[in-house]
C-alpha cells in the first residue's frame, strides 16, 4: 500500500489550524509518529518538532483499507512571530519509513493579515486577521 502525508490549513474565526494528515493501512499505525516542524530544513524530527502525535492501532476499525490519521496544530491568533516555513513529517519506528511533506509558509503582512502558501491541496490561502474571513 501507499503511505503518504499531506498538509492543509483551515481557519475558524481568529484560529488557524495547521493539519498534517497521514494516509496508511490500519496495521501500519502502530509505531508511527506524525510531527510538525517550523524553520527546520534538515533536522525535522519528533524531538525538534512543535507538536507530535503517536499513532495507535484502533481495533474498532474494520477491514484492511486505507485510513487517515491527523495531527492538528492550532494557533489562536497568528502574529508576526508565526511567520516562517513549516513541514509535516512522519516516521515509523517499526518499518523505518520516513515521510516528508511539502514545505508551506505563513507570512504575516504589514496590513495585519497573513497568508499561508505552498499547500498542495489549496495552493494559496489568504486570511484577514481582523475580519476572520477566508478569501
Amino acid at each position: 500500500g501507499c503511505i503518504n502525508i499531506t498538509s492543509s490549513a483551515s481557519q475558524e474565526g481568529t484560529r488557524l489550524n495547521l493539519i498534517c494528515t497521514v494516509w496508511h493501512k490500519k496495521e501500519e499505525a502502530e509505531g508511527f509518529v506524525v510531527f510538525l516542524c517550523k524553520d527546520r530544513s534538515g533536522d525535522c524530527s519528533p524531538e525538534t518538532s512543535l507538536k507530535q502525535l503517536r499513532l495507535k492501532r484502533d481495533p474498532g476499525i474494520d477491514g484492511v483499507g486505507e485510513i487517515s490519521s491527523q495531527l492538528m496544530f492550532t494557533i489562536s491568533q497568528v502574529t508576526p512571530l508565526h511567520s516562517g516555513t513549516y513541514q509535516c513529517c512522519a516516521r515509523s519506528q517499526k518499518s523505518g519509513i520516513r515521510l516528508q511533506g511539502h514545505f508551506f509558509s505563513i507570512l504575516f503582512t504589514e496590513t495585519g493579515n497573513y497568508t499561508v502558501t505552498g499547500l498542495k491541496q489549496r495552493q494559496h490561502l489568504e486570511f484577514s486577521h481582523n475580519e476572520g474571513t477566508l478569501s
Epitope: T48, P80, L81, G84
Partner: antibody
C-alpha cells in the same frame, strides 16, 4: 522543567549601555519566540521586545525603538537585551519570558533582573 | 494602541467572598489573558484565551468576556488569592499590552 535565568542587571549611570542575558533550559529553545517584559518599581507590566525562534525578526514597543536591541543565540540557549543611552525611566525589573506558540500568552517567566539607572 | 483599563485598582475581600475584576479594552480584542503576581515574585499565567485556566490554577477561578469587556472571577476567596492581577492582550501593530493591574487584598 523550564528554567529562565536573567543576569546582567545592576546600577548604571544615565547615558551608559547595558546587556542583559537570559539563559534558558528545559525546553527546545530554538522552537520558541522569546520576549522581554519590564516592570518599573511599584508599577505594572510593560512588554518591551520580542524575537522570533530563529532570531531574524525582532519587534519592539515604540518607546524603546532605536535604543533597545533584542537578540538570541540558539547554540547557547540564550537571549539578550542590549540597552543603549540608558534613561532613568528604564529603571525596572526586566523579565525574560517565552511566547506560547499556540496562544499570545507569555507562559514562562524568569525571576527578573533589576536595572537601576541613576547617577 | 489598544489601552486596557482594569477596575478596581485595589480591593479587599473576605475569605469565602466572590470577587470580580474587570478589564476593559479601548477597542474590541479577540482574547484576554490574566496573570497573577505576588510581591517579590514573577508574574504567573493564570487564565489564558479568556477562559482557560493555566496549569495548577484552582477551579474557583474563572474568566469570561468578549469584545471590549472581560473579567476574572474568584468564587470563594482564599488567603492565597491575595495578589495583583494583570490582564493582557495582543493586537497588531502595537503587539502586547497589559492592564495597570488590580491589587487584591485579604480583609
Amino acid at each position: 522543567e523550564v528554567k529562565l535565568v536573567e543576569s546582567g542587571g545592576g546600577l548604571v549611570q544615565p547615558g551608559r549601555s547595558l546587556k542583559l542575558s537570559c539563559a534558558a533550559s528545559g525546553f527546545i529553545f530554538s522552537n520558541y519566540a522569546m520576549a522581554w517584559v519590564r516592570q518599573a518599581p511599584t508599577k505594572g507590566l510593560e512588554w518591551v521586545a520580542s524575537v522570533n525562534s530563529g532570531g531574524a525578526n525582532t519587534y519592539y514597543r515604540d518607546s524603546v525603538k532605536g535604543r533597545f536591541t533584542i537578540s538570541r543565540d540558539n547554540a547557547k540557549n540564550t537571549q539578550y537585551l542590549h540597552i543603549d543611552s540608558l534613561r532613568s525611566e528604564d529603571t525596572a525589573t526586566y523579565y525574560c519570558a517565552t511566547h506560547n506558540y499556540e496562544s499570545t500568552v507569555f507562559d514562562y517567566w524568569g525571576q527578573g533582573a533589576m536595572v537601576t539607572v541613576s547617577s | 494602541e489598544i489601552v486596557l483599563t482594569q477596575s478596581p485598582t485595589t480591593m479587599t475581600a473576605s475569605p469565602g467572598e466572590k470577587v470580580t475584576i474587570t478589564c476593559r479594552a479601548s477597542s474590541s480584542v479577540s482574547y484576554m489573558h490574566w496573570y497573577q503576581q505576588k510581591p517579590g515574585a514573577s508574574p504567573k499565567p493564570w487564565i489564558y484565551e479568556t477562559s482557560k485556566l493555566a496549569s495548577g490554577v484552582p477551579d474557583r477561578f474563572s474568566g469570561s468576556g468578549s469584545g471590549t469587556s472581560y473579567s476574572l472571577t474568584i468564587n470563594n476567596m482564599e488567603a492565597e488569592d491575595a495578589a495583583t492581577y494583570y490582564c493582557q492582550q495582543w493586537n497588531y501593530p502595537s503587539m502586547y499590552t497589559f492592564g495597570a493591574g488590580t491589587k487584591l487584598e485579604l480583609k
